[in-house]
């Protein structure tokens, strides 16, 4: 099956790589604009230059193109704890990330929030914190894992999900008491 091509892709595929078909004259192939620039005017004829202009401050194009306008630079979302890793340039969008010892949780494909990496207090680090994944902790005896933090089994009440995790310790305590009374 031939993949469905949009009008722009169909037009571009008629011309060699790095060129696009003139919107008013499909016999002319114009050279695309370099990254960091945008299309101001189509080439007037075959072999003639396309009029490309550099993107203005606050905008960019990251690849060769024939866009009539540059793309607006992204802004890092402070309310999501994001920080700017690198500023926007004419040929590269802003790069946003999290602070040291934080990881990203993606709410959607392009929107992430920064959260602090777990320190594994009362436990050991099983897997270190990564860009998109919190630390994985293994808890010491007498502690259970709750939202990736090690919490004392003394905080575990009956009928909660921690009972299974704390059961071995409870049994050990009972066993010690039982052996002491015989």
């Amino acid at each position: 099956l031939v993949p469905h091509l949009g009008d722009r892709e169909k037009r571009d595929s008629v011309c060699p790589q790095g060129k696009y078909i003139h919107p008013q004259n499909n016999s002319i192939c114009c050279t695309k604009c370099h990254k960091g620039t945008y299309l101001y005017n189509d080439c007037p004829g075959p072999g003639q230059d396309t009029d490309c202009r550099e993107c203005e401050s606050g905008s960019f194009t990251a690849s060769e193109n024939h866009l009539r306008h540059c793309l607006s630079c992204s802004k890092c979302r402070k309310e999501m704890g994001q920080v700017e890793i690198s500023s926007c340039t004419v040929d590269r969008d802003t790069v946003c990330g999290c602070r040291k010892n934080q990881y990203r949780h993606y709410w959607s494909e392009n929107l992430f929030q920064c959260f602090n990496c777990s320190l594994c207090l009362n436990g050991t680090v099983h897997l270190s914190c990564q860009e998109k994944q919190n630390t994985v902790c293994t808890c010491h005896a007498g502690f259970f894992l709750r939202e990736n933090e090690c919490v004392s089994c003394s905080n575990c009440k009956k009928s909660l999900e921690c009972t299974k995790l704390c059961l071995p310790q409870i049994e050990n305590v009972k066993g010690t008491e039982d052996s002491g009374t015989t």
């Epitope: 990881y103 949780h105 993606y106 494909e109 992430f112 959260f115 919190n134 939202e147 909660l160 999900e161």
Partner: nanobody, 120 residues
């Protein structure tokens, strides 16, 4: 066994309001981030809003900011979603969900959902 039971959906006119509730059981509700996920007809799941266990931290999708408010009552193991100024594009099945932090977008454990229809 984790159970999440949504209620409060229905038919509302554009500009109207609805309040959704989610009764949670089978886990320690106050320990977890909880939220609302929606799925419009023919579209994928999307996070609408979420709230931390203590209620001190929240997330809202840009499309609902200023119109929707998430809240929780840990003493009642209940999550709420107040939806105001409803629009046609808000029509969807709304699911209560347990948030699994890290990576994503993932949609955690969800309830059966409640249908919200916005139509005049």
């Amino acid at each position: 066994e984790v159970q999440l039971l949504e209620s409060g959906g229905g038919l509302v006119q554009p500009g109207g309001s609805l309040r959704l509730s989610c009764a949670a059981s089978g886990f320690t509700f106050e320990w977890y981030w909880m939220g609302w996920v929606r799925q419009a007809p023919g579209k994928g799941l999307e996070w609408v809003t979420a709230i931390s266990g203590s209620g001190g931290s929240t997330f809202y999708a840009d499309s609902v900011k200023g119109r929707f408010t998430i809240s929780r009552d840990n003493s009642k193991n209940t999550l709420y979603l107040q939806m105001n100024s409803l629009r046609a594009e808000d029509a969807a099945v709304y699911y209560c969900a347990k948030v699994k932090l890290g990576g994503g977008p993932n949609f955690g454990y969800r309830g059966q959902g409640t249908l919200v229809t916005v139509s005049s």
